[in-house]
Every structure is written in C-alpha cells, then in structure tokens.
C-alpha cells in the first residue's frame, strides 16, 4: 500500500489532467481526491500514466467503491481495466454494451482471458439474459468469447439468438457448453431444409446425442472429418459401420488417418472386424470374427 502523506499546497489537484504524470506515487495518493477521479474518469485514458501511477489510481477507486465500481466509472476505465483482477470485476454490475465494447477493445492483445470471461459474465447477469445484441457484440469484438461463459450462463440464450452465432465463435467451446447450445440450435434451425439445416447445425454438433447423429446419417449430409472428430464419444460409439459410412460419405476415407484418435479409436474397438473391412481402409482393432459380445453392464443393472 502507498504510505499516506499530506499534499503540498502547490500540488493540490483540482482537475485530472496531464500535469499529473509528473506526480510521484506518494503525491498522487495524497493529492488526488477519489471523488474527483471518479467524476473525471473519462480523462484518465488520454493521459500517459505509468503502470505504477495507474496502481495508485486503482487504489483510490477501490477505497471509494469497496463494493464495486459504478458503471459510469467502469465505462471510462480504459487502460486502467488492465489492472483489474477477476475478483475486482466480480463486484461490478454492467448492463451497457458500450461499456463491454470499450473494455474488450482495451483488453485486445493482452493476456486477460480470465478478466474478459468475468466481465462477460457480469454483463449477462446485468442484462438478465444473453440477448441478441450481446451475442452480436461478442462475435464482433471478441470472437471465441462466447465459449468463456459457463453452461449455466449459456442456458439463458434464447433459441432465436443462435442464428447470430458463427462457427468460429464456437471453436473453443467445450462439451458441456455445446450440450447446452445444441438443443437451442436444433430448435432454432428446425424449419430449414436438409442441406441448409446441416450447414447451420454443424458447429453445434459436439452436443448432439446419438439419435440425432443417426438421423443425420440418413440424410446424405457428407459430414467432414473435423466435425465427426468433435462429436461426443458417447454419440459415436453406438453407430454402426454402415451408419458411419452413410454419415461421412466420401469423407469416410479420412478415418484411416484418425484411426488412433478418439472417438474413432474407441468406435473401432466396438465394431466387428468384418464390418470394418468393408470400409476398404485397413482399419484394425475391431472385434475378431466369431467372437461373442457380452454386455456386462446389462447384467449388473439387472442384479
């Protein structure tokens, strides 16, 4: 913490301006009134403060607003945002997308994924749901940030908003997030024709259950290998060789390269070798011909 001293009369601060860059840390602490700083936050970002000086200004604001900054201050944080921790941001209540845009711009090029994720979370909480305007802002100013939200937060996305989500916005989404988004996407695109539906639903398929994947295999979609590799292991394992062949179409030729990778590896282990041989790729590791498969999980469930 900055030690407290009294402010020399000639150093008294009546407005936030460039003269402050010549103040030492102790002088800033003693001479800048926190309320004045808060009222003139819009000037701070135009002044080339050092990181040490920004620490002092942050300390001032923290003392003035121990429960969290008001949005009028947050909106004008500028480079002071780089000094904020996720714990600081968790105290905020943010509803304005202009505030979100301003801070996303500042954070670009800095290692601030935890802070940005927390900020987005606060915006969703502040606005009550992940509405179309918020999604549009995220996709425009922070591609991939949608996936920083928890499954719980993503559950507030109305299906009508899903159309605004682009494939690249889902690149970093994990299985739990796609589990939440997939049913919404399915609902959002349900009235589309086969090929158009597949193009739209494809980025969300990491959350699809087996029955939906099986249904796709009957629709001549020719799923690419990259999409297939992102399907849930549990969704892929029950598929037959014939279903995978129909699902992938010409892309089935790519299974050879993915032979050792999940979910292909796990799927191969569950297929009869005879059936795998029909793919003409030399895939190995299937159940040898003549072997009987006992599903012990069924016996355990009965006993």
């Amino acid at each position: 913490d900055v030690e407290r001293t009294t402010c020399p009369p000639e150093k008294e601060v009546h407005e936030i301006d460039e003269s402050l860059i010549f103040y030492k840390k102790r002088e800033l602490e003693a001479c800048v009134d926190a309320a004045l700083l808060a009222a003139q936050m819009d000037r701070v970002d135009a002044i080339p403060f050092t990181y040490e000086q920004l620490d002092v200004l942050k300390h001032k604001l923290d003392e003035l607003y121990p429960q969290g900054y008001p949005e009028s201050v947050i909106r004008h944080l500028g480079h002071l945002f780089l000094k904020m921790s996720p714990e600081d941001i968790r105290k905020w209540n943010v509803t304005s997308l202009e505030t979100l845009k301003a801070l996303l711009k500042v954070s670009k090029g800095h290692e601030m994924s935890a802070q940005v994720a927390t900020l987005i979370d606060r915006v969703v909480v502040g606005r009550g749901q992940l509405d179309k305007d918020t999604v549009d802002t995220l996709t425009a100013f922070c591609p991939g940030c949608l996936c920083s939200l928890s499954p719980e937060r993503l559950s507030s996305v109305p299906p009508s908003v899903i159309g605004a989500v682009r494939p690249q916005d889902l690149d970093t989404c994990g299985p739990r997030q796609l589990d939440v988004l997939y049913p919404k996407a399915r609902l959002a695109f349900q009235n589309m024709s086969g090929s158009e539906y597949f193009v739209k639903i494809r980025p969300f398929l990491g959350g699809a259950p087996t029955e939906d994947v099986k249904a796709l295999s009957q629709q001549n979609v020719s799923m690419d290998l990259a999409t297939f590799m992102k399907l849930r292991r549990e969704a892929v394992l029950p598929l037959t060789v014939a279903e995978v062949q129909k699902l992938l179409g010409p892309h089935v030729e790519g299974l050879k390269v993915e032979e050792q990778h999940s979910p292909v590896r796990d799927w191969i282990l569950k297929q009869r070798q005879d059936d795998l041989d029909t793919l003409g790729l030399g895939l190995q590791g299937g159940i040898p011909n003549g072997y009987l498969i006992l599903d012990l999980s069924v016996r355990e469930a009965l006993s």
């Epitope: 790519g254 050879k256 003409g280 790729l281």
Partner: antibody, heavy 121, light 107 residues
Framework: EVQLVQSGAEVKKPGASVKVSCKAS????????MHWVRQAPGQGLEWMGN????????YYNERFRSRVTMTVDKSTSTVYMELSSLRSEDTAVYYC??????????????WGQGTTVTVSS | DIQMTQSPSSLSASVGDRVTITCKAS??????IAWYQQKPGKAPKLLIH???ELQPGVPSRFSGSGSGTDFTFTISSLQPEDIATYYC?????????FGGGTKVEIK
C-alpha cells in the same frame, strides 16, 4: 513393390463408351481406395473420383457423375473406370492412383502408367 | 469444391536459378498440399507432401512452405533434369483438386 498396371490405349467414336482397367499388386488391395485422374492433351490433371475396393462404393467428381462408372473385381485386384457418351474433349490420358493415408484424406504416392483414350470420328 | 490457383502457368529460367511456384487455395486447407513433377509421357511423381515433407530420394533442392491458403514450391538451384511440369494437389477434402500446372523450361 507396389505396382498399378493399366490396360492399353483405346480409340473410340463419339457417343461410344470406354472401359479402362487398373490391376494392383504389391500391397493389400482392400486397404486402399483407388482414384482416377485424367489429363487432356496439353492440359492439367483432373480428379474424376474414387472407389472403395472392399465394398465397391464409388464417389464421383460432380462433373463426371452422369457418365462415369467405377467398379472393382476383388478376385483379380482390379478396378475399372467406364466413361460413356464419349465426346472429343474426353480424349485424354487416364490414370489410376493410390493414396497414402499419411495425413488428412491422403495424397497419391503410386500411379498407373496411364491409358490413352482417343475419341475421334 | 476447393479451387487451387497455380501460378505462373509457365516460366523460363537458367540453370542454377532459384525457381518459385505458388498455389492459392480457395479456402483454408491447413498444410494438406502435395507437389508433383510430371515429365512428358510419364505419370506424375510425388515430390513433397504435407506442404514441406520431402519424399525419400527427392533432392533437397526441392522445398515447400505455406499454410492455410497460400503455398510455395521452390527449386533452390534449377538443374537440367528439373525440366517438367509441376502440379500442386490439395487433399484437405476427399474430393481432391489439382492446380493448373507450371511448365518449367531452361533459358
């Protein structure tokens, strides 16, 4: 040693069909799909399609879909490519090519010697 | 389908010159590009796969680079036996496509 040996040159009239063969040896025939590529005189290479040698399932380039038929005879490790309704612009060298599945969908590491098909009235 | 635009369509260079051929894909193909050499009356011969991996027995004067949509094939010091037509092939999609070819001649 992997070898792809193709049938000999053919001269056909417009409207006729031609069937080119490609006999494979030196590897497990049913472990690699076979592709067909053609090259018109002085032109570049054009992928025509491929066939799964195990179940005979083909996939064709949209450009040839209505006229091409690819088949397989597992007993002789031979694949066939038949092109119908021939026209003069089908005059080309037709190659069979085997992919190596090193990455993605595989690049062609072995080629047949080529079969020249001439379409002329 | 993925289009492969190869340039130049032909070039003339002196023995010992550095020769560069480019291929541009119509969409991202990662590094899934191969380069072939074809001499008159012969089948294409694989030189490079996965953008820069040299096939065994191929002279080290041949090299490749790039990723995404822009790729380059280079002959560091042109030799008389390099007179041929060179093609790129994308295999990021099962429906393979070739570039239009570059005919390399000696000045």
């Amino acid at each position: 040693e992997v070898q792809l040996v193709q049938s000999g040159a053919e001269v056909k009239k417009p409207g006729a069909s031609v069937k080119v063969s490609c006999k494979a040896s030196g590897y497990t025939f049913t472990n690699y799909w076979m592709h067909w590529v053609r090259q018109a005189p002085g032109q570049g290479l054009e992928w025509m399609g491929n066939i799964n040698p195990s179940n005979g399932g083909p996939y064709y380039n949209e450009r040839f879909r209505s006229r091409v038929t690819m088949t397989v005879d597992k007993s002789t490790s031979t694949v066939y490519m038949e092109l119908s309704s021939l026209r003069s612009e089908d005059t080309a060298v037709y190659y069979c090519a085997r992919p190596y599945y090193g990455s993605s969908y595989g690049y062609f590491d072995y080629w047949g010697q080529g079969t020249t098909v001439t379409v002329s009235s | 389908d993925i289009q492969m635009t190869q340039s130049p369509s032909s070039l003339s260079a002196s023995v010992g010159d550095r020769v560069t051929i480019t291929c541009k894909a119509s969409q991202d193909i990662n590094k899934y590009i191969a380069w072939y050499q074809q001499k008159p009356g012969k089948a294409p011969k694989l030189l490079i796969h996965y953008t820069s991996e040299l096939q065994p027995g191929v002279p080290s004067r041949f090299s490749g680079s790039g990723s995404g949509t822009d790729f380059t094939f280079t002959i560091s010091s042109l030799q008389p036996e390099d007179i041929a037509t060179y093609y790129c092939l994308q295999y990021a999609n099962p429906l393979r496509t070739f570039g239009g070819g570059t005919k390399v001649e000696i000045k």
